[in-house]
Interface confidence: low
């Protein structure tokens, strides 16, 4: 018995294509690239029908439906633009991912262009089906310093010029240390900020001496020391990591990392600092910021900063030799011979940064660590040298500039 003539579906074909079909003849219905066979609301690659004894086909010819990649995945810190009218998500449609500029940029300068493939998956020429990554931009504050300051005997910082600075605060709102934002969820600070004062009779650091993540919080976007303002972001602490070679007695490797419970939103007042690309040149000018004590032992109302030069390592070692204090290779010194400009109590862990004039970007040089009193003549401020421990920082945080 002969079965009726078959019409292939729109955007599809039937094989074999014959003038006539008889009992037991089978045909395979398939669709053009970018289309799927749709039968009874079920999508499939092909569909087979057979000519029956009574001269009818075993099933109706299915339709061919264009492949739909559906709504593209959301990109953290990114946006999606549809290149096709009506925001189409079907075969050959195109979308473009971009990062929330100017605070995030796309890793490897990827085009961000994805096309809906015949398989129903958004595909990028380089990344395949993986989404691009938006990385935080570091060291490029929206507000630049109008004047360079010449925390101890320093000047009030201009709001927004130090967007990487973090305040470590007790739950009662009392600040106790500074820090710097790295990447989107890490704070680098001084290890000595994260433990209680040790018993001089038995100066051994025990786990019980460490601050628990629930003992303190991080405040970013802060300008005033105690007054709250609109740009602050208060963040919980997930985890703290002290440098494995930190020595609380000598302050060697006085650096620690605080992982945030959640990422801050980057904006004009909150932005990470860049990690150093190489060693710091002696004599280079650096800026140190903090809310620590000022002249006459008073705390300032706002963030303060000083501009001071990096001091030759051997000069610094000689300055501290009479006090039997070691200035080791993981430390870097800054200040002026005549004194007067220095970090002080409460500045610990805060940033010492320098400007790369070619790139216009700020880099972290050190974190406030120790010194003999504050701003004393012939005594320099000693800072934990970030370049020395950069590998450890990158290993723990995964942060790259």
């Amino acid at each position: 018995n002969e079965c009726p003539e078959l019409q292939p579906p729109v955007h599809g074909k039937i094989e074999p294509s014959q003038a006539k079909y008889f009992f037991k003849d089978q045909v395979l219905v398939s669709c053009d690239t970018g289309y799927k066979v749709l039968k009874d609301n079920v999508e499939m690659d092909t569909f087979q029908i057979e000519c029956l004894k009574d001269g009818t086909w075993s099933n109706k010819i299915p339709t061919c439906k264009i492949v739909d990649c559906r709504a593209p995945g959301e990109l953290e810190h990114g946006l999606i633009t549809f290149s096709t009218r009506n925001n189409l998500t079907t075969y050959k449609s195109e979308i473009k991912y971009s990062c929330q500029e100017p605070y995030y940029k796309m890793l490897n300068n990827n085009t961000g262009i994805y096309t809906c493939s015949a398989q129903g998956v958004w595909m990028n020429k380089v990344l395949g089906r993986s989404l691009p990554t938006c990385l935080p931009v570091c060291g490029l504050p929206k507000f630049s310093r109008k004047l360079m300051a010449r925390i101890f005997n320093g000047r009030p910082a201009q709001k927004g010029t130090t967007p990487w600075i973090a305040m470590l605060s007790h739950l009662n709102g009392q600040p106790f240390c500074g820090g710097s934002l790295l990447g989107s969820s890490w704070i680098v600070t001084a290890a000595h900020c994260l433990h209680q004062s040790l018993d001089p009779e038995d100066p051994t650091l025990r786990d019980s001496d460490l601050l628990s993540p629930s003992d303190f919080k991080i405040i970013l976007g802060k300008h005033w020391r105690l007054r709250s303002d609109e740009n602050e972001q208060h963040l919980g602490v997930k985890h703290t990591t002290l440098h494995p070679q930190y020595d609380p007695n000598t302050f060697e490797n006085d650096v620690a990392l605080v992982e945030l419970l959640e990422s801050p939103v980057l904006n004009a007042f909150v932005m990470p600092i860049c990690l150093p690309e190489g060693p710091q040149q002696e004599g280079a000018m650096v800026i140190v910021s903090g809310w620590g004590k000022q002249f006459l032992q008073r705390f300032p109302e706002t963030l303060m900063e000083i501009e001071i030069p990096i001091v030759d390592h051997s000069t610094c070692q000689k300055a501290y030799a009479p006090l039997k204090k070691k200035v080791t290779r993981d430390m870097i010194c800054a200040g002026e011979k005549e004194g007067g400009k220095d970090a002080c109590a409460g500045d610990s862990g805060g940033p010492m940064v320098t400007l790369n004039r070619e790139r216009g970007q700020w880099y972290l040089v050190g974190t406030v660590s120790w010194g003999d009193d504050c701003g004393k003549k012939d005594r320099y401020g000693v800072y934990s040298y970030i370049h020395h421990n950069k590998d450890w920082i990158q290993r723990v945080t995964g942060v790259r500039n």
Epitope: N172, H234, G236
Partner: antibody
Framework: SVEESGGRLVTPGTPLTLTCTVS????????MGWVRQAPGEGLEYIGI?????DIYYATWAKGRFTISKTSTTVDLKITSPTTEDTATYFC????????????????WGLGTLVTVSS | AVVLTQTASPVSAAVGGTVTINCQAS??????LAWYQQKPGQRPKLLIY???NLASGVPSRFSGSGSGTEYTLTISDLESADAATYYC??????????????FGGGTKVEIK
């Protein structure tokens, strides 16, 4: 905007899930909280889900409620409702982006009414 | 858990007058306090955060003050539209939010 849905009359012990649908902003940037108000009574804080998905419940609400979220919705499941759970349930967005610290609420939905009765 | 005790309801005042509502915390809350206004059948509206910061769009007739355990909301130049119930909220973060986020019982303001 923020809009709650799913409120209805349920019998005691029948689990009920309320949904908060957001538009105009991303849940990956904001913390979202649930607050309820029994008829003629004051506001009562239930819990908050952070932009990263960390969930914090009021002590009294632990075990009684479950908060979860998708990319555009935040759900509040009342695990085993009692008549005392009869209230209008509000979903609200926290003021500070990326900060569970400042869990005061500056964008509220209109609320959805749940009545628990046998 | 922190307990917030508000001025007893109702508080009555005339149009053009001033109303003061107090909120007392059972322990120091470090100015982590917000004030809300709620009219019958409506959603709450944020007025003040950080004890004294005015939320955007809120008239300057509303002001907040206080520290430690004692906080105050003041409404001056009262208008009939100010008739509502006012709540204080102590807010906290992270693990401390379990018992930290709590509302006062509310204070109803009536305009004569």
């Amino acid at each position: 905007s923020v809009e709650e849905s799913g409120g209805r009359l349920v019998t005691p012990g029948t689990p009920l899930t309320l949904t908060c649908t957001v538009s105009g902003f991303s849940l990956s940037n904001y913390n979202m909280g649930w607050v309820r108000q029994a008829p003629g009574e004051g506001l009562e804080y239930i819990g908050i889900i952070s932009s990263q998905g960390d969930i914090y419940y009021a002590t009294w609400a632990k075990g009684r409620f479950t908060i979860s979220k998708t990319s555009t919705t935040v759900d509040l499941k009342i695990t085993s409702p009692t008549t005392e759970d009869t209230a209008t349930y509000f979903c609200a967005r926290a003021r500070h982006v990326g900060s569970a610290a400042d869990s005061y609420f500056h964008l509220w939905g209109l609320g959805t009414l749940v009545t628990v009765s046998s | 858990a922190v307990v917030l005790t508000q001025t007893a309801s109702p508080v009555s005042a005339a149009v053009g007058g001033t109303v003061t509502i107090n909120c007392q915390a059972s322990e120091e809350i470090y100015r982590n306090l917000a004030w809300y206004q709620q009219k019958p059948g409506q959603r709450p509206k944020l007025l003040i955060y950080g004890a004294s910061n005015l939320a955007s769009g809120v008239p300057s007739r509303f002001s907040g003050s206080g520290s430690g355990t004692e906080y105050t909301l003041t409404i001056s130049d009262l208008e009939s539209a100010d008739a509502a119930t006012y709540y204080c909220q102590r807010y906290a973060w992270g693990k401390n939010s379990a018992d930290g986020n709590t509302f006062g019982g509310g204070t109803k303001v009536e305009i004569k």
